[in-house]
């Protein structure tokens, strides 16, 4: 009896998982054995396919063979007992077109209302992702053991933190990766399960912000309680990115070490061109808090993001107003290359009632203005990144007589 | 293999200096903190301080902040654990330990054995 | 500073019985805690870090747990190469401390 070729063979890549499943032709037909031969793009010769060989079963794993993920590879599988089948042939297919992306690994560490997730690529240097590692990004599903309300975080890097959260609360979550570059979405990790601590003594410091005086950057922080002693570390933004190592090297700011009030002011100069993270940490001698919320923070836009510079071109029942680019020192404009939104305050002059416009456009219409009426406005900039959050303090306030009736045109 | 293979046993007098040295191997100490930890006889384990051998920052427990220095040198992967003015308490087994992932101690060297006595 | 204690300085048990080392921070560590094996003329080995993760290669009848205060290494069906003494130590704030160790005696 002729040996009918497999049918239906299915090709699974997982990171560096490669796996051939297919369906046996003739299930009555007993002692079959599988086997593949692989074609390389611009060959004619058909090699065989180690590990997948004289197979039994119907699946079997060639992830012991060195491919180039790049390029295109054939397959083609025939049946053998004593006599064997004709070859079937697969569809090409190019490896790293076809791969998955695997479960992650992940690992918790807990606080008393805060998560910390390390995340790592499932497989470790992997062949598949080799020059794709700094590219990943994650996004997780979490949630109250008790409740199973989902909440979904898109857009985390290797290092992630949740704050906010109960203490002595079971949470759960699961995480996948992704390639944005590649349009890959990976298959989510097994779900991690942690519990937040008891309730810490001493709470984080809260509220921290960064502002620029003079060749000083002013870091200011809140605190609850009086005669505490803060220590300021700062770690580069991109190290959370770094995908195998997890360890983060965080470095003092020298003059914010034991500092007993809650601000403290250093030289612009400890820090160089970049972004960065910070966060903040208070004693009491015997006891200690968790690290604050770390907070972003980005050297360009905190030396330069300052008020905007504006014209207001007055009609009667309305201001236009055209925004340009602030300017330093010896009158040159200050190039702004991150996109930001604009708050602009107007008020009548005789009174204390404020309007405000937020607008990302930089000519603006301020309307329903009573004509012969003086109006003040001041403007301020804040940036789009949420993530940055930061804004520039307001312009000094402009003030304008709206013209007269029927100007309108 | 990650190895961290320590200087052999001193024995100097009281008063003396003493440097002792931890070599690394199958990992760059660049990329790492590497710890020094005190071990006297039948006691616990007390943690000196750490070096960041990237930048040289470094970190000490109080007691032990004026009596060691710490340093390193990146381009023969060795850290160092220098002692001033010792006295027989500074008698113990001195493990180099490579700080890992999270920060946790994840490879310990073999242990110097340093004894001060005239 | 942080104090670990180890409240039992020594343990017996006997071959593939369990026993359970505790260690209590003098303050909340979170999950910052790690374990290590000490055999008798050698140098410590890491068996858990962060509370309850396993260092690769080490025997799953290690178990770590606890947060906040409280943490205990459970070593399920003890062996005889198990005797030893055991540590626990934080590592959220400097200095690093250690708990004063637990040593485990086989009868």
């Known amino acids: 009896k002729n040996l009918k070729s497999p049918q239906k063979v299915e090709v699974d890549i997982i990171d560096d998982n490669f796996i051939l499943r297919w369906n046996r032709s003739d299930e009555s037909v007993g002692n079959v054995t599988f086997s593949f031969d692989y074609q390389k793009t611009g060959m004619d010769n058909w090699i065989k396919l180690s590990g997948c060989q004289n197979i039994t079963s119907t699946k079997c794993n060639f992830s012991s063979l060195k491919l180039n993920v790049y390029e295109e590879i054939k397959l083609r599988i025939r049946a053998e007992k004593e006599n064997t089948s004709s070859w079937y042939e697969v569809d090409s297919f190019t490896p790293f077109r076809k791969a998955q992306i695997g479960p992650p690994e992940v690992h918790l560490e807990a606080e008393d209302k805060a998560i910390v997730i390390h995340i790592s690529p499932g497989t470790k240097d992997s062949v598949m992702w080799a020059l794709d590692g700094l590219s990943f990004t994650y996004s997780l599903v979490i949630w109250k053991n008790s409740s199973g309300v989902e909440e979904r975080i898109e857009n985390i890097y290797s290092r992630h933190k949740i704050y906010k959260l109960s203490p002595e609360t079971t949470y759960c979550l699961k995480v996948k990766a992704a390639l944005l570059t590649s349009w890959k979405i990976g298959v989510y990790s097994p779900v991690h399960c942690i519990k937040t601590t008891v309730e810490n003594e001493l709470p984080p410091p809260e509220n921290i912000e960064v502002s620029v005086q003079n060749q000083n950057y002013v870091l200011k922080w809140d605190y609850t309680y009086a005669n505490m002693t803060f220590q300021v570390q700062w770690l580069h933004a991109f190290l959370k990115r770094n995908p195998g190592n997890h360890l983060y090297k965080w470095k003092q700011i020298p003059d914010c070490e034991n500092v007993k009030t809650t601000q403290c002011v250093f030289p612009q100069n400890v820090f160089q061109k970049g972004i960065y993270l910070l966060r903040v940490q208070a004693s009491d001698g015997n006891n200690t808090s968790f690290w604050s919320e770390e907070i972003k923070f980005d050297t360009e836009i905190q030396a330069f993001l300052l008020p905007p510079v504006f014209n207001i071109r007055s009609l009667s029942d309305s201001f236009h107003i055209y925004i340009g680019a602030p300017k330093q020192s010896g009158n040159t404009p200050v190039i702004q290359d991150y996109p930001l939104i604009y708050e602009i305050i107007f008020w009548e002059n005789t009174s204390n009632a404020e309007r405000k416009i937020i607008e990302k456009k930089t000519d603006v219409t301020v309307p329903n203005l009573k004509p012969l009426t003086v109006y003040c406005v001041k403007a301020r900039a804040h940036t789009m990144d949420e993530k940055l959050n930061k804004s520039s303090v307001f312009s000094d306030a402009v003030c304008e007589k709206t013209k007269p009736g029927n100007t309108s045109k | 293999e990650v190895q961290l293979q320590q200087s052999g046993a001193d024995l100097v007098r009281p008063g003396a200096s003493v440097k002792l040295s931890c070599t690394a191997s199958?990992?760059?100490?660049?990329?790492?903190?590497i710890h020094w930890v005190k071990q006297r006889t039948e006691q616990g384990l007390e943690w000196i301080g750490r070096?960041?051998?990237?930048?040289?920052?470094?970190k000490y427990a109080p007691k032990f902040q004026v009596k060691t220095t710490i340093t390193a040198d990146t381009s023969s992967n060795t850290a160092y654990l220098q002692f001033s003015s010792l006295t027989s308490e500074d008698t113990a087994v001195y493990y180099c330990?490579?700080?890992?992932?999270?920060?946790?101690?994840?490879?310990w060297g073999q242990g110097s054995t340093l004894t001060v006595s005239s | 500073d942080i104090v670990m204690t180890q409240s039992q300085k020594f343990m017996s048990t006997s071959v593939g019985d369990r026993v359970s080392v505790t260690c209590k921070a003098s303050q909340n560590v979170g999950t910052n805690v790690a374990w290590y094996q000490q055999k008798p003329g050698q140098s410590p080995k890491a068996l858990i870090y962060?509370?309850?993760y396993r260092y690769s290669g080490v025997p799953d009848r290690f178990t770590g747990s606890g947060s906040g205060t409280d943490f205990t290494l459970t070593i399920s069906n003890v062996q005889s190469e198990d005797l030893a003494e055991y540590f626990c130590q934080q590592c959220i704030n400097y200095p690093y401390t250690f708990g004063g160790g637990t040593k485990l005696e086989i009868k």
């Open positions: 199958g990992f760059n100490i660049k990329d790492y903190y």
């Open positions: 070096i960041d051998p990237e930048d040289g920052e470094t």
């Open positions: 962060s509370a309850s």
């Open positions: 330990v490579r700080g890992g992932n999270f920060y946790y101690f994840d490879y």
